[in-house]
Interface confidence: medium
């Protein structure tokens, strides 16, 4: 007996071929011998089976001796043995219909779990193997679970159901809701405008929710809410913003914040949270701000950085086109009695300059005594 696997909701075509390449009488019946459909000349006739409105054939193929049974919008309970009677012969086809669904929404927050459930006909013993978009394979029986979803799990999951050495493939689109980057760092000179961007790693038709940016300044003892906002159908509206600093927020996605100027008292790290409508949990993105200041006070040239810097970062002071006068893995360096010229303060990581501030040191002239 021929075995055909079908997918719930899909259309299946069971073939039945006569030796004569012409239109002759045929009937399709189920295992209870209830007529599903057949022909009367070139007319399609239907029997009293429960498939009535979902069963069809291809009349255009009959005169080639092909008498298919088409079953639309397959259901698990359509799993049965179907018999085609043609030319005093009986052709039996066993149809097994499977369904594979994500037990929750297919839009899941980063870190959440995905469970896939297989619906199968009684008496079947299928095995399932799924491959994630990042190539990870998981195997199971009736259910498959993946905990701690990552951004790379977004995309099409391909699941193969194996039964009677036949296989049927399901494709499930999973969207992991997350920011494109878990963390980012912005390096700015004192006084410069600061742009923070929080691009999302997914696109959906309608996006509604609310968010907040909490900020822990390096100099402050506690964190502070800098801004709260609403998101309605991808439109951003500010609900509340602090007076110092007074952040500006873009009205469209991606979420975009502007700090009018980088100041040492703002250096630190923030956490932007986004709560999406109808989702439990929140999306998070960490953002860090490092601020550099170069100053000359009397005979002292100083360069300082504030904010979350890694211990391996190097801070240097050098006269333009010369070797560094001072280089330290510290957050402040200085030179006493600097030569006149253009001095550069550099913050670098393994030779790569992250932040640079220039300061001009003027020559010192001895003032002549007035008569």
């Amino acid at each position: 007996k021929k075995v055909v696997l079908g997918k719930k909701g899909d259309t299946v075509e069971l073939t039945c071929t006569a030796s004569q390449k012409k239109s002759i009488q045929f009937h399709w019946k189920n295992s209870n011998q209830i007529k599903i459909l057949g022909n009367q000349g070139s007319f399609l006739t239907k029997g009293p089976s429960k498939l009535n409105d979902r069963a069809d054939s291809r009349r255009s193929l009959w005169d080639q001796g092909n008498f298919p049974l088409i079953i639309k919008n397959l259901k698990i309970e359509d799993s049965d043995t179907y018999i085609c009677e043609v030319e005093d012969q009986k052709e039996e086809v066993q149809l097994l219909v499977f369904g594979l669904t994500a037990n929750s929404d297919t839009h899941l927050l980063q870190g959440q779990s995905l469970t896939l459930t297989l619906e199968s006909p009684p008496g079947s013993s299928p095995s399932v193997q799924c491959r994630s978009p990042r190539g990870k394979n998981i195997q199971g029986g009736k259910t498959l679970s993946v905990s701690q979803l990552e951004l790379q799990d977004s995309g099409t999951w391909t699941c193969t159901v194996l039964q009677n050495q036949k296989k049927v493939e399901f494709k499930i689109d999973i969207v992991v809701l997350a920011f494109q980057k878990a963390s980012s760092i912005v390096y700015k000179k004192e006084g410069e405008q600061v742009e923070f961007s929080f691009p999302l790693a997914f696109t959906v038709e309608k996006l509604t929710g609310s968010g907040e940016l909490w900020w822990q300044a390096e100099r402050a003892s506690s964190s502070k809410s800098w801004i709260t906002f609403d998101l309605k159908n991808k439109e951003v509206s500010v609900k509340r913003v602090t007076q110092d600093p007074k952040l500006q927020m873009g009205k469209k996605l991606p979420l975009h914040l502007t700090l009018p100027q980088a100041l040492p008292q703002y250096a630190g790290s923030g956490n932007l949270t986004l709560a999406l409508e109808a989702k439990t949990g929140k999306l998070h993105q960490e953002v860090n701000l490092v601020v550099m200041r170069a100053t000359q006070l009397q005979k002292n040239l100083t360069c300082e950085v504030w904010g979350p810097t890694s211990p391996k970062l190097m801070l240097s002071l050098k006269l333009e086109n010369k070797e560094a006068k001072v280089s330290k893995r510290e957050k402040a360096v200085w030179v006493l009695n600097p030569e006149a010229g253009m001095w550069q303060c550099l913050l670098s990581d393994s030779g790569q300059v992250l932040l640079e501030s220039n300061i001009k040191v003027l020559p010192t002239w001895s003032t002549p005594v007035q008569p």
Partner: antibody, heavy 117, light 110 residues
């Protein structure tokens, strides 16, 4: 040799009827499905209807099923296309055709012109 | 119903290879077979079957005609174009009711 010979076309006034004939030879008439295909002036091909000569039942393009009818004369191996309530847009060349090895129309009549004016 | 779209015209010089495409709005395959056919129609004549089941040459048709299919698109190729090949060409599907023909392509030999 398979042959399909057509007759019966002509000029007719709108609302009137016309009967086209398709006479076959060189094959067992009852073993094959015969189709009718039409072509409006300067236009493409359009399938009209087909008949299962063995059972005598016919199937029509939805566009024509209310006005066109297929009948046959088995003793003369001839098929007829009865066209009623003709309209100016029915003007064109009408062909009868039979399938070959595959489902393509391998054998065609010479075509008969119909003008509704 | 299945809609078949063809380019309105194609041309080539004698000896050249000309290809005509036919894009179907849905699949025309059944149980491993492709129900796509190609016809040539000379002015004032009945159509002539060239290719059946996408790639099979009808008997008596010159071997310079060939057919192929990929997905829902079929192609008719004429290699070594000859003056007598100047004609209208139609694709046709017989997979589902009603059988439908393509929009037709006029091939001109320059």
């Amino acid at each position: 040799e398979v042959q399909l010979v057509q007759s019966g076309g002509g000029v007719v006034q709108p609302g009137r009827s016309l009967r086209l004939s398709c006479s076959s030879s060189g094959f067992i008439f009852s073993d094959y499905v015969i189709n009718w295909v039409r072509q409006a002036p300067g236009k493409g091909l359009e399938w009209v209807a087909e008949t299962y000569t063995g059972s005598g039942s016919s199937y029509y393009n939805e566009k024509f099923k209310d006005r066109f009818t297929i009948s046959r004369n088995d003793s003369k191996n001839t098929l007829f296309l009865q066209m009623d309530s003709l309209r100016p847009e029915d003007t064109g060349v009408y062909f009868c055709a039979r399938r070959g090895k595959g489902t393509g129309f391998a054998f065609w009549g010479q075509g008969t012109p119909v003008t509704v004016s | 119903e299945s809609v078949l779209t063809q380019p309105p015209s194609a041309s080539g010089t004698p000896g050249q290879r000309v290809t005509i495409s036919c894009k179907a709005s849905q699949s025309v395959d059944y149980d491993g077979d492709s129900y796509m056919n190609w016809y040539q129609q000379l002015p004032g004549m009945a159509p002539k079957l060239l290719i059946y089941a996408a790639s099979n040459l009808e008997s008596g048709v010159p071997t310079r005609f060939s057919g192929s299919k990929s997905g829902t698109s079929a192609s008719l190729a004429i290699s070594g174009l000859e003056a007598e090949d100047e004609s209208d060409y139609y694709c046709q599907q017989s997979y589902e009711d009603p059988p439908t023909f393509g929009t037709g392509t006029k091939v001109t030999v320059l």
